[in-house]
């Protein structure tokens, strides 16, 4: 379809780099959540940091291209990296408007499918880009 994808846009304080240039921020009349209309893909992404007690959103926005996973209607995150011991970054890609607003489910920490404690380690900030 010719019309463009619109995604939720968020970048946590302290996250290095930005995906803002991959789209055009929209005026939605409310401060949050922000919306971004993608320039180069029809695909949204989300990154959450899962610790023992909670999941915290790190980044949401547009992908730079359409890749495997972008055909998903919903955000189904999969584990990608360990920014620090006890926390895991989960990412999703999906291809409907605002599909990255929230995830459908996250596996509990340490459950099968979550990288073990020997998984990739990264410095804060770098891990976000590893996940992307």
């Amino acid at each position: 379809p010719p019309n463009r994808r619109t995604c939720v846009f968020f970048e946590a304080p302290g996250v290095r780099g930005s995906t803002k240039t991959l789209g055009e921020l929209l005026d939605t009349g409310t401060e949050l959540p922000r919306a971004i209309r993608c320039l180069y893909s029809r695909c949204c992404f989300g990154i959450w940091n899962l610790t023992q007690d909670r999941a915290q959103v790190e980044m949401q926005g547009c992908r730079d291209s359409d890749e495997p996973g972008c055909e998903s209607l919903h955000c189904d995150p999969s584990p990608r990296a360990h920014p620090s011991p006890g926390s895991t970054l989960f990412t999703c890609s999906c291809g409907t408007d605002f599909c990255n607003a929230n995830y459908s489910h996250l596996p509990p920490p340490g459950s099968p499918g979550t990288p073990g404690s020997q998984g990739p380690q990264a410095a804060p900030g770098e891990s976000i880009w590893m996940a992307l």
């Epitope: 463009r4 929209l26 005026d27 180069y40």
Partner: antibody
Framework: DVQLQESGPGLVKPSQSLSLTCTVT?????????WNWIRQFPGNKLEWMGY???????SYNPSLKSRISITRDTSKNQFFLQLNSVTTEDTATYYC??????????WGQGTLVTVSA | DIVLTQSPASLAVSLGQRATISCRAS??????????MHWYQQKPGQPPKLLIY???NLESGIPARFSGSGSRTDFTLTINPVEADDVATYYC?????????FGGGTKLEIK
């Protein structure tokens, strides 16, 4: 300041390929932006042809998709248009343009290409 | 493709008066209330120059005599007051859907 300059042959024979170069100064084509080709026909109708973006991804106007290719040389900060199987209907002034968003803030001066035997 | 129809094709306005140019889209160019319609000025022998983006935002360095308004399918570029330097052809462009398309142009002359 971002500046763009088109160059290439001003005369192309029918059925041959049209090849143009856009040289960008004042900004790296790998930093940001989409780098577009837009043409203006005699009579002034404007047509967006396609772009190559900072990461090298391309998007083309479906009306040209079978004939068009946009590539780049990052070492020279240039991007290129190739249009195959041209006819007299492709006679136009060809502009390169840079866009951070979905409108065109930066334009070259344009180069007239005539398709004629 | 979205077709943009500009009217009038040409107009003549006295210096100091108001010029109004219309652009009508064959379908809405709005996304969640944001209008993806833009306006350009082109003088003979020059490339188009961005005046207004997203319906009503004035590009940096463009005089406040230029303004844009409208939403969905109906948009207007207003020049008030018109100056001699405004003699040019004006184009609208939509970017709500691919491919981007332009209007046919409106030629502004001084009466």
């Amino acid at each position: 300041d971002v500046q763009l300059q088109e160059s290439g042959p001003g005369l192309v024979k029918p059925s041959q390929s049209l090849s143009l170069t856009c040289t960008v100064t004042g900004y790296s084509i790998t930093s940001d932006f989409a780098w577009n080709w837009i043409r203006q026909f005699p009579g002034n109708k404007l047509e967006w042809m396609g772009y190559i973006n900072f990461s090298g991804s391309t998007s083309y106007n479906p009306s040209l998709k079978s004939r068009i290719s946009i590539t780049r040389d990052t070492s020279k900060n240039q991007f290129f248009l190739q249009l195959n199987s041209v006819t007299t209907e492709d006679t136009a002034t060809y502009y390169c343009a840079g866009s951070r968003y979905s409108w065109f803030a930066y334009w070259g001066q344009g180069t007239l290409v005539t398709v004629s035997a | 493709d979205i077709v943009l129809t500009q009217s009038p094709a040409s107009l003549a306005v006295s210096l100091g008066q108001r010029a109004t140019i219309s652009c009508r889209a064959s379908e809405s160019v709005d996304t969640y209330g944001n209008s993806f319609m833009h306006w350009y000025q082109q003088k003979p022998g020059q490339p188009p120059k961005l005046l207004i983006y997203r319906a009503s935002n004035l590009e940096s360095g463009i005089p406040a005599r230029f303004s844009g308004s409208g939403s969905r399918t109906d948009f207007t570029l207003t020049i008030n007051p018109v100056e001699a330097d405004d003699v040019a052809t004006y184009y609208c462009q939509q970017s709500n859907e691919d491919p981007y398309t332009f209007g046919g142009g409106t030629k502004l002359e001084i009466k």
